[in-house]
Amino acid sequence: VPAQVVLTPYKPEPGYECQISQEYYDRKAQMCCAKCPPGQYVKHFCNKTSDTVCADCEASMYTQVWNQFRTCLSCSSSCTTDQVEIRACTKQQNRVCACEAGRYCALKTHSGSCRQCMRLSKCGPGFGVASSRAPNGNVLCKACAPGTFSDTTSSTDVCRPHRICSILAIPGNASTDAVCAPESPTLSAIPRTLYVSQPEPTRSQPLDQEPGPSQTPSILTSLGSTPIIEQSTKGG
Protein backbone atom coordinates (compact mmCIF):
# COMPACT_ATOMS: atom_id res chain seq x y z
CA VAL A 1 0.00 0.00 0.00
CA PRO A 2 1.61 3.30 -1.04
CA ALA A 3 2.38 5.66 1.83
CA GLN A 4 0.19 8.73 2.10
CA VAL A 5 1.78 11.94 0.89
CA VAL A 6 1.78 14.37 3.81
CA LEU A 7 2.16 18.04 2.99
CA THR A 8 4.74 19.98 4.97
CA PRO A 9 4.79 21.55 7.42
CA TYR A 10 3.05 19.10 9.73
CA LYS A 11 3.28 18.06 13.36
CA PRO A 12 4.58 14.47 13.61
CA GLU A 13 2.41 11.96 15.43
CA PRO A 14 3.81 10.89 18.82
CA GLY A 15 6.43 8.16 18.26
CA TYR A 16 6.81 9.04 14.54
CA GLU A 17 9.66 10.94 12.89
CA CYS A 18 9.93 13.16 9.86
CA GLN A 19 10.94 11.51 6.56
CA ILE A 20 14.69 11.82 6.88
CA SER A 21 15.56 12.05 3.18
CA GLN A 22 13.50 15.10 2.20
CA GLU A 23 12.26 16.49 5.50
CA TYR A 24 13.76 17.78 8.71
CA TYR A 25 12.36 18.49 12.17
CA ASP A 26 12.34 22.19 12.99
CA ARG A 27 12.71 22.47 16.79
CA LYS A 28 11.53 26.08 16.92
CA ALA A 29 8.38 25.39 14.92
CA GLN A 30 8.13 21.81 16.29
CA MET A 31 7.09 20.75 12.79
CA CYS A 32 8.28 18.46 10.01
CA CYS A 33 9.42 20.78 7.24
CA ALA A 34 10.70 20.31 3.69
CA LYS A 35 14.40 20.19 3.02
CA CYS A 36 15.72 22.06 -0.02
CA PRO A 37 16.63 19.96 -3.08
CA PRO A 38 20.17 19.69 -4.50
CA GLY A 39 21.13 23.00 -6.13
CA GLN A 40 19.18 25.06 -3.59
CA TYR A 41 19.56 26.35 -0.02
CA VAL A 42 17.22 27.58 2.74
CA LYS A 43 16.24 31.20 2.22
CA HIS A 44 13.61 31.12 4.99
CA PHE A 45 13.06 28.40 7.53
CA CYS A 46 9.56 27.12 8.08
CA ASN A 47 7.13 28.09 10.80
CA LYS A 48 3.86 26.58 12.01
CA THR A 49 1.96 27.91 8.99
CA SER A 50 4.44 28.18 6.12
CA ASP A 51 6.95 25.72 4.73
CA THR A 52 10.66 26.17 4.05
CA VAL A 53 11.46 28.69 1.32
CA CYS A 54 14.33 27.56 -0.91
CA ALA A 55 16.45 29.52 -3.38
CA ASP A 56 18.94 28.55 -6.10
CA CYS A 57 22.62 28.49 -5.29
CA GLU A 58 24.58 31.37 -6.71
CA ALA A 59 27.39 31.00 -9.24
CA SER A 60 30.38 28.89 -8.10
CA MET A 61 28.31 27.44 -5.25
CA TYR A 62 26.49 24.14 -4.87
CA THR A 63 24.53 21.75 -2.70
CA GLN A 64 24.69 18.09 -3.61
CA VAL A 65 22.00 16.64 -1.32
CA TRP A 66 18.56 17.46 0.07
CA ASN A 67 19.48 19.95 2.80
CA GLN A 68 18.57 22.58 5.33
CA PHE A 69 21.72 24.67 4.74
CA ARG A 70 21.61 28.45 5.24
CA THR A 71 24.16 28.87 2.47
CA CYS A 72 25.42 26.83 -0.45
CA LEU A 73 28.91 25.36 -0.38
CA SER A 74 31.69 26.99 -2.38
CA CYS A 75 33.01 25.00 -5.31
CA SER A 76 36.67 24.00 -5.16
CA SER A 77 39.05 26.37 -6.89
CA SER A 78 39.80 25.88 -10.57
CA CYS A 79 41.95 22.89 -11.55
CA THR A 80 45.68 23.55 -11.72
CA THR A 81 47.72 23.35 -14.92
CA ASP A 82 48.74 19.72 -14.21
CA GLN A 83 45.12 18.68 -13.76
CA VAL A 84 42.08 18.13 -15.92
CA GLU A 85 38.53 18.98 -14.89
CA ILE A 86 36.51 15.79 -15.05
CA ARG A 87 33.38 17.29 -13.49
CA ALA A 88 32.43 20.95 -13.73
CA CYS A 89 31.12 23.07 -10.89
CA THR A 90 27.31 23.29 -11.13
CA LYS A 91 24.56 24.25 -8.67
CA GLN A 92 24.26 20.57 -7.74
CA GLN A 93 27.86 19.33 -7.68
CA ASN A 94 31.37 20.37 -6.83
CA ARG A 95 34.16 20.59 -9.36
CA VAL A 96 36.32 17.42 -9.59
CA CYS A 97 39.92 17.61 -10.77
CA ALA A 98 42.05 14.65 -11.81
CA CYS A 99 45.72 14.43 -12.61
CA GLU A 100 46.79 14.66 -16.22
CA ALA A 101 48.52 11.72 -17.91
CA GLY A 102 51.92 10.96 -16.45
CA ARG A 103 50.95 12.14 -12.96
CA TYR A 104 49.28 10.57 -9.94
CA CYS A 105 47.25 12.05 -7.11
CA ALA A 106 49.40 12.52 -4.02
CA LEU A 107 46.67 14.27 -1.99
CA LYS A 108 42.96 13.61 -2.43
CA THR A 109 40.06 15.65 -1.06
CA HIS A 110 37.24 13.93 0.84
CA SER A 111 35.04 14.47 -2.22
CA GLY A 112 37.37 12.44 -4.44
CA SER A 113 38.94 15.37 -6.25
CA CYS A 114 42.71 15.73 -6.37
CA ARG A 115 44.42 18.47 -4.42
CA GLN A 116 48.02 17.71 -5.41
CA CYS A 117 49.40 15.85 -8.41
CA MET A 118 52.90 14.43 -8.64
CA ARG A 119 54.87 13.21 -11.60
CA LEU A 120 54.80 9.40 -11.92
CA SER A 121 58.04 7.65 -11.07
CA LYS A 122 59.96 6.20 -13.99
CA CYS A 123 61.35 2.70 -14.10
CA GLY A 124 64.89 2.54 -15.40
CA PRO A 125 66.48 -0.06 -17.68
CA GLY A 126 66.16 -3.54 -16.23
CA PHE A 127 62.92 -2.60 -14.52
CA GLY A 128 59.38 -2.51 -15.89
CA VAL A 129 56.12 -1.02 -14.68
CA ALA A 130 54.24 -3.52 -12.49
CA SER A 131 50.60 -4.31 -13.19
CA SER A 132 49.57 -3.00 -9.76
CA ARG A 133 50.04 0.52 -8.42
CA ALA A 134 51.35 1.73 -5.07
CA PRO A 135 48.62 2.63 -2.52
CA ASN A 136 49.12 6.30 -3.37
CA GLY A 137 48.64 5.64 -7.08
CA ASN A 138 52.29 5.98 -8.05
CA VAL A 139 53.96 3.53 -10.41
CA LEU A 140 55.55 0.41 -8.95
CA CYS A 141 58.64 -0.90 -10.68
CA LYS A 142 59.63 -4.55 -10.77
CA ALA A 143 62.90 -6.06 -11.85
CA CYS A 144 62.58 -7.71 -15.24
CA ALA A 145 62.18 -11.44 -14.65
CA PRO A 146 64.20 -14.06 -16.55
CA GLY A 147 63.73 -13.92 -20.30
CA THR A 148 62.37 -10.37 -20.20
CA PHE A 149 63.92 -6.93 -20.44
CA SER A 150 63.29 -3.21 -20.44
CA ASP A 151 65.75 -0.89 -22.12
CA THR A 152 63.85 2.33 -21.42
CA THR A 153 63.34 4.81 -18.60
CA SER A 154 59.60 5.10 -18.52
CA SER A 155 56.49 5.32 -16.35
CA THR A 156 54.52 3.12 -18.76
CA ASP A 157 56.81 0.48 -20.27
CA VAL A 158 56.55 -3.06 -18.94
CA CYS A 159 59.23 -5.73 -19.17
CA ARG A 160 58.81 -7.59 -22.44
CA PRO A 161 60.27 -10.91 -23.56
CA HIS A 162 63.52 -11.19 -25.46
CA ARG A 163 63.08 -11.87 -29.13
CA ILE A 164 63.63 -15.49 -30.08
CA CYS A 165 66.32 -15.86 -32.71
CA SER A 166 67.01 -18.45 -35.34
CA ILE A 167 70.67 -17.61 -34.82
CA LEU A 168 71.50 -15.87 -31.55
CA ALA A 169 74.33 -13.34 -31.82
CA ILE A 170 74.17 -11.91 -28.29
CA PRO A 171 71.94 -13.19 -25.49
CA GLY A 172 69.62 -10.69 -23.89
CA ASN A 173 69.71 -9.61 -20.26
CA ALA A 174 67.41 -7.60 -18.01
CA SER A 175 68.12 -4.34 -19.80
CA THR A 176 68.82 -5.39 -23.39
CA ASP A 177 67.03 -7.51 -25.96
CA ALA A 178 68.64 -10.52 -27.56
CA VAL A 179 70.50 -9.73 -30.76
CA CYS A 180 69.83 -12.04 -33.67
CA ALA A 181 72.45 -12.80 -36.29
CA PRO A 182 71.48 -12.34 -39.94
CA GLU A 183 69.91 -15.49 -41.25
CA SER A 184 71.37 -17.25 -44.29
CA PRO A 185 68.66 -17.70 -46.95
CA THR A 186 69.68 -21.33 -47.39
CA LEU A 187 68.80 -22.13 -43.79
CA SER A 188 65.11 -21.88 -44.45
CA ALA A 189 65.39 -24.80 -46.84
CA ILE A 190 66.72 -27.24 -44.22
CA PRO A 191 64.18 -30.07 -44.03
CA ARG A 192 62.68 -31.70 -40.94
CA THR A 193 63.50 -28.87 -38.55
CA LEU A 194 61.60 -25.88 -37.30
CA TYR A 195 62.93 -22.57 -36.08
CA VAL A 196 61.69 -19.07 -35.43
CA SER A 197 63.19 -15.64 -35.19
CA GLN A 198 61.81 -12.16 -34.42
CA PRO A 199 58.84 -11.68 -32.09
CA GLU A 200 55.61 -10.11 -33.18
CA PRO A 201 53.52 -9.16 -30.15
CA THR A 202 49.88 -10.12 -30.59
CA ARG A 203 49.07 -6.97 -28.65
CA SER A 204 50.52 -3.50 -29.13
CA GLN A 205 53.58 -2.62 -27.09
CA PRO A 206 53.59 0.54 -24.97
CA LEU A 207 55.34 3.32 -26.89
CA ASP A 208 58.79 4.18 -25.62
CA GLN A 209 58.77 7.48 -23.84
CA GLU A 210 61.53 10.00 -23.88
CA PRO A 211 63.83 9.36 -20.92
CA GLY A 212 63.72 12.04 -18.27
CA PRO A 213 64.97 12.59 -14.73
CA SER A 214 64.10 9.45 -12.78
CA GLN A 215 62.58 9.67 -9.33
CA THR A 216 63.34 6.79 -7.00
CA PRO A 217 60.55 4.31 -7.79
CA SER A 218 59.07 1.70 -5.51
CA ILE A 219 60.47 -1.74 -6.25
CA LEU A 220 57.99 -4.58 -6.38
CA THR A 221 59.31 -8.06 -5.74
CA SER A 222 57.51 -10.60 -7.87
CA LEU A 223 57.95 -14.00 -9.50
CA GLY A 224 61.57 -14.34 -10.55
CA SER A 225 62.32 -10.71 -9.96
CA THR A 226 65.64 -11.18 -8.22
CA PRO A 227 68.30 -9.13 -10.04
CA ILE A 228 69.75 -11.12 -12.91
CA ILE A 229 73.37 -12.04 -12.25
CA GLU A 230 75.65 -11.60 -15.21
CA GLN A 231 77.92 -14.59 -15.69
CA SER A 232 80.80 -14.66 -18.12
CA THR A 233 80.27 -18.40 -18.56
CA LYS A 234 76.76 -17.66 -19.82
CA GLY A 235 77.89 -15.60 -22.78
CA GLY A 236 78.40 -12.21 -21.15
Epitope: P146, T233, K234, G235
Partner: antibody, heavy 127, light 109 residues
Amino acid sequence: QSLEESGGGLVKPEGSLTLTCAVSGFDLNSYYWICWARQAPGKGLEWIACIDGGSTGSAYYASWAKGRLSISKASSTTVTLQMTSLTAADTATYFCARVQSYVGYANYGYPNYFNLWGPGTLVTVSS
Amino acid sequence: IEMTQTPSSVSAAVGGTVTINCQSSEDIDSYLAWYQQKPGQPPKLLIYHASYLTSGVPSRFSGSRSGTEFTLTISDLECDDAATYYCQSAYYSSSADNTFGGGTEVVVK
Protein backbone atom coordinates in the same frame (compact mmCIF):
# COMPACT_ATOMS: atom_id res chain seq x y z
CA GLN B 1 70.67 -25.31 -38.30
CA SER B 2 69.16 -28.58 -37.26
CA LEU B 3 68.82 -31.13 -34.49
CA GLU B 4 68.81 -34.86 -35.15
CA GLU B 5 68.01 -37.59 -32.63
CA SER B 6 69.42 -41.08 -32.94
CA GLY B 7 69.71 -44.26 -30.87
CA GLY B 8 66.05 -45.20 -30.78
CA GLY B 9 64.82 -48.70 -31.45
CA LEU B 10 63.45 -51.80 -29.78
CA VAL B 11 64.58 -52.51 -26.22
CA LYS B 12 63.48 -55.11 -23.68
CA PRO B 13 61.80 -54.15 -20.39
CA GLU B 14 64.34 -53.29 -17.65
CA GLY B 15 66.85 -52.60 -20.41
CA SER B 16 68.88 -49.42 -20.99
CA LEU B 17 69.30 -47.10 -23.95
CA THR B 18 71.25 -43.97 -24.78
CA LEU B 19 69.77 -41.44 -27.17
CA THR B 20 71.91 -38.84 -28.90
CA CYS B 21 70.97 -35.37 -30.11
CA ALA B 22 73.35 -34.04 -32.74
CA VAL B 23 73.29 -30.34 -33.53
CA SER B 24 74.46 -28.82 -36.77
CA GLY B 25 74.63 -25.28 -38.08
CA PHE B 26 75.37 -23.85 -34.62
CA ASP B 27 77.65 -24.56 -31.68
CA LEU B 28 76.57 -25.93 -28.34
CA ASN B 29 77.62 -23.01 -26.19
CA SER B 30 76.26 -20.87 -23.40
CA TYR B 31 73.81 -19.28 -25.85
CA TYR B 32 71.62 -22.39 -25.91
CA TRP B 33 70.17 -25.10 -23.72
CA ILE B 34 69.19 -28.47 -25.12
CA CYS B 35 66.14 -30.25 -23.77
CA TRP B 36 64.48 -33.62 -24.24
CA ALA B 37 60.76 -34.27 -24.49
CA ARG B 38 58.82 -37.36 -25.45
CA GLN B 39 55.48 -38.34 -26.90
CA ALA B 40 53.85 -41.75 -26.45
CA PRO B 41 51.98 -43.00 -29.54
CA GLY B 42 48.73 -41.05 -29.91
CA LYS B 43 49.41 -39.15 -26.66
CA GLY B 44 50.56 -35.70 -25.59
CA LEU B 45 54.00 -34.19 -25.10
CA GLU B 46 55.99 -34.72 -21.92
CA TRP B 47 59.04 -32.67 -20.94
CA ILE B 48 61.99 -34.67 -19.58
CA ALA B 49 65.10 -32.58 -18.92
CA CYS B 50 67.31 -29.69 -20.04
CA ILE B 51 71.06 -29.06 -20.00
CA ASP B 52 73.18 -25.95 -20.47
CA GLY B 53 74.97 -26.02 -23.83
CA GLY B 54 77.86 -24.10 -22.25
CA SER B 55 80.52 -25.14 -19.80
CA THR B 56 78.49 -25.08 -16.58
CA GLY B 57 76.95 -28.52 -17.08
CA SER B 58 73.84 -27.30 -15.27
CA ALA B 59 70.91 -29.62 -15.83
CA TYR B 60 67.44 -30.07 -14.43
CA TYR B 61 64.75 -32.69 -14.77
CA ALA B 62 61.04 -33.29 -14.53
CA SER B 63 60.52 -34.84 -11.09
CA TRP B 64 59.39 -38.18 -12.56
CA ALA B 65 62.60 -38.47 -14.62
CA LYS B 66 65.12 -37.95 -11.82
CA GLY B 67 67.31 -40.96 -11.13
CA ARG B 68 66.27 -43.08 -14.11
CA LEU B 69 67.06 -40.67 -16.93
CA SER B 70 70.27 -38.72 -17.24
CA ILE B 71 71.06 -35.84 -19.61
CA SER B 72 74.63 -34.89 -20.45
CA LYS B 73 76.64 -32.89 -22.95
CA ALA B 74 78.88 -35.40 -24.73
CA SER B 75 80.67 -32.95 -27.04
CA SER B 76 80.35 -29.51 -28.58
CA THR B 77 77.83 -30.95 -31.01
CA THR B 78 76.03 -33.71 -29.09
CA VAL B 79 73.80 -34.12 -26.05
CA THR B 80 72.81 -37.57 -24.77
CA LEU B 81 69.91 -38.95 -22.77
CA GLN B 82 70.71 -42.13 -20.87
CA MET B 83 67.67 -44.19 -19.90
CA THR B 84 67.68 -47.14 -17.50
CA SER B 85 65.09 -49.58 -16.13
CA LEU B 86 62.88 -49.05 -19.14
CA THR B 87 59.24 -50.14 -19.09
CA ALA B 88 56.46 -50.24 -21.68
CA ALA B 89 55.38 -46.81 -20.38
CA ASP B 90 58.62 -45.38 -21.82
CA THR B 91 57.59 -46.32 -25.36
CA ALA B 92 57.49 -42.99 -27.19
CA THR B 93 59.02 -40.76 -29.81
CA TYR B 94 61.84 -38.84 -28.12
CA PHE B 95 62.54 -35.29 -29.31
CA CYS B 96 65.43 -33.02 -28.55
CA ALA B 97 64.73 -29.29 -28.69
CA ARG B 98 66.71 -26.09 -28.37
CA VAL B 99 66.07 -23.26 -25.93
CA GLN B 100 67.60 -19.83 -26.38
CA SER B 101 69.59 -18.70 -23.36
CA TYR B 102 70.03 -15.26 -21.89
CA VAL B 103 72.44 -13.72 -19.41
CA GLY B 104 71.81 -15.25 -16.00
CA TYR B 105 69.80 -18.22 -17.31
CA ALA B 106 71.61 -20.70 -15.04
CA ASN B 107 70.23 -18.92 -12.00
CA TYR B 108 66.67 -19.75 -12.94
CA GLY B 109 66.40 -22.48 -15.58
CA TYR B 110 63.57 -20.76 -17.44
CA PRO B 111 61.90 -19.69 -19.65
CA ASN B 112 61.94 -22.80 -21.81
CA TYR B 113 60.60 -21.85 -25.21
CA PHE B 114 61.47 -24.73 -27.56
CA ASN B 115 62.09 -22.95 -30.84
CA LEU B 116 64.04 -25.63 -32.74
CA TRP B 117 63.11 -29.33 -32.71
CA GLY B 118 64.56 -32.49 -34.15
CA PRO B 119 62.31 -34.92 -36.05
CA GLY B 120 62.32 -37.42 -33.16
CA THR B 121 63.45 -41.00 -32.65
CA LEU B 122 61.10 -43.83 -31.69
CA VAL B 123 61.88 -45.97 -28.65
CA THR B 124 59.82 -49.15 -28.26
CA VAL B 125 60.04 -51.09 -25.01
CA SER B 126 58.70 -54.58 -25.51
CA SER B 127 59.68 -58.16 -24.82
CA ILE C 1 52.81 -27.41 -12.20
CA GLU C 2 49.82 -28.99 -13.88
CA MET C 3 48.56 -27.60 -17.17
CA THR C 4 44.89 -28.29 -17.82
CA GLN C 5 43.99 -27.76 -21.46
CA THR C 6 40.41 -27.62 -22.77
CA PRO C 7 38.72 -28.75 -24.90
CA SER C 8 40.44 -31.98 -25.98
CA SER C 9 38.92 -31.62 -29.45
CA VAL C 10 37.19 -28.84 -31.34
CA SER C 11 35.68 -28.63 -34.79
CA ALA C 12 35.02 -25.49 -36.81
CA ALA C 13 34.39 -24.46 -40.40
CA VAL C 14 36.87 -22.73 -42.69
CA GLY C 15 36.76 -19.01 -41.87
CA GLY C 16 35.55 -19.67 -38.34
CA THR C 17 37.20 -19.05 -35.00
CA VAL C 18 38.55 -21.53 -32.47
CA THR C 19 39.44 -20.81 -28.84
CA ILE C 20 41.64 -23.13 -26.76
CA ASN C 21 42.08 -22.63 -23.03
CA CYS C 22 44.90 -23.60 -20.72
CA GLN C 23 44.86 -23.32 -16.94
CA SER C 24 48.00 -23.60 -14.82
CA SER C 25 47.86 -24.96 -11.29
CA GLU C 26 50.39 -22.36 -10.10
CA ASP C 27 51.23 -18.78 -10.96
CA ILE C 28 53.59 -18.96 -13.93
CA ASP C 29 53.47 -15.25 -14.73
CA SER C 30 53.36 -15.02 -18.54
CA TYR C 31 55.74 -17.95 -19.10
CA LEU C 32 53.50 -19.87 -21.45
CA ALA C 33 54.02 -21.13 -25.00
CA TRP C 34 51.66 -22.55 -27.61
CA TYR C 35 52.76 -25.20 -30.12
CA GLN C 36 51.19 -26.64 -33.24
CA GLN C 37 51.87 -30.27 -34.14
CA LYS C 38 50.86 -32.11 -37.28
CA PRO C 39 50.99 -35.92 -37.60
CA GLY C 40 54.53 -37.27 -38.07
CA GLN C 41 56.12 -33.87 -37.36
CA PRO C 42 57.73 -32.28 -34.31
CA PRO C 43 55.85 -29.45 -32.61
CA LYS C 44 56.22 -25.90 -33.93
CA LEU C 45 56.44 -22.92 -31.57
CA LEU C 46 53.64 -20.46 -32.41
CA ILE C 47 53.41 -18.13 -29.42
CA TYR C 48 55.71 -17.47 -26.49
CA HIS C 49 55.40 -15.41 -23.32
CA ALA C 50 51.61 -15.87 -23.53
CA SER C 51 51.01 -13.45 -26.39
CA TYR C 52 54.08 -13.00 -28.61
CA LEU C 53 53.95 -14.47 -32.10
CA THR C 54 57.07 -16.12 -33.47
CA SER C 55 58.33 -15.15 -36.90
CA GLY C 56 56.30 -16.36 -39.84
CA VAL C 57 53.21 -17.21 -37.77
CA PRO C 58 50.11 -15.51 -39.23
CA SER C 59 48.40 -12.84 -37.12
CA ARG C 60 45.26 -15.00 -37.21
CA PHE C 61 46.86 -16.70 -34.21
CA SER C 62 46.74 -14.77 -30.96
CA GLY C 63 47.38 -15.50 -27.32
CA SER C 64 46.21 -13.88 -24.12
CA ARG C 65 46.55 -14.26 -20.37
CA SER C 66 44.26 -13.62 -17.43
CA GLY C 67 45.94 -14.68 -14.18
CA THR C 68 46.62 -18.40 -14.47
CA GLU C 69 44.27 -18.80 -17.43
CA PHE C 70 45.68 -18.63 -20.95
CA THR C 71 43.88 -18.61 -24.29
CA LEU C 72 44.91 -19.37 -27.85
CA THR C 73 42.56 -17.97 -30.49
CA ILE C 74 42.72 -18.95 -34.17
CA SER C 75 40.53 -16.75 -36.34
CA ASP C 76 39.76 -16.99 -40.08
CA LEU C 77 40.43 -20.71 -39.81
CA GLU C 78 42.20 -22.35 -42.76
CA CYS C 79 42.47 -26.03 -43.72
CA ASP C 80 46.18 -25.89 -42.91
CA ASP C 81 45.34 -25.08 -39.27
CA ALA C 82 44.08 -28.63 -38.73
CA ALA C 83 46.53 -29.95 -36.11
CA THR C 84 46.94 -30.65 -32.42
CA TYR C 85 47.78 -27.64 -30.28
CA TYR C 86 49.65 -27.79 -26.98
CA CYS C 87 50.18 -25.21 -24.27
CA GLN C 88 53.39 -25.42 -22.26
CA SER C 89 54.49 -23.83 -19.03
CA ALA C 90 57.93 -22.42 -19.72
CA TYR C 91 58.44 -21.70 -16.04
CA TYR C 92 60.64 -24.20 -14.25
CA SER C 93 59.87 -25.21 -10.69
CA SER C 94 60.76 -28.27 -8.62
CA SER C 95 57.18 -29.48 -9.05
CA ALA C 96 57.35 -29.39 -12.84
CA ASP C 97 56.08 -32.93 -13.51
CA ASN C 98 54.64 -32.16 -16.92
CA THR C 99 54.91 -28.73 -18.37
CA PHE C 100 52.66 -29.47 -21.37
CA GLY C 101 48.89 -29.41 -21.53
CA GLY C 102 47.07 -32.49 -22.76
CA GLY C 103 46.60 -31.10 -26.27
CA THR C 104 43.62 -29.96 -28.33
CA GLU C 105 42.84 -31.46 -31.71
CA VAL C 106 41.50 -28.85 -34.13
CA VAL C 107 39.38 -30.25 -36.94
CA VAL C 108 38.62 -27.91 -39.84
CA LYS C 109 35.42 -28.70 -41.76
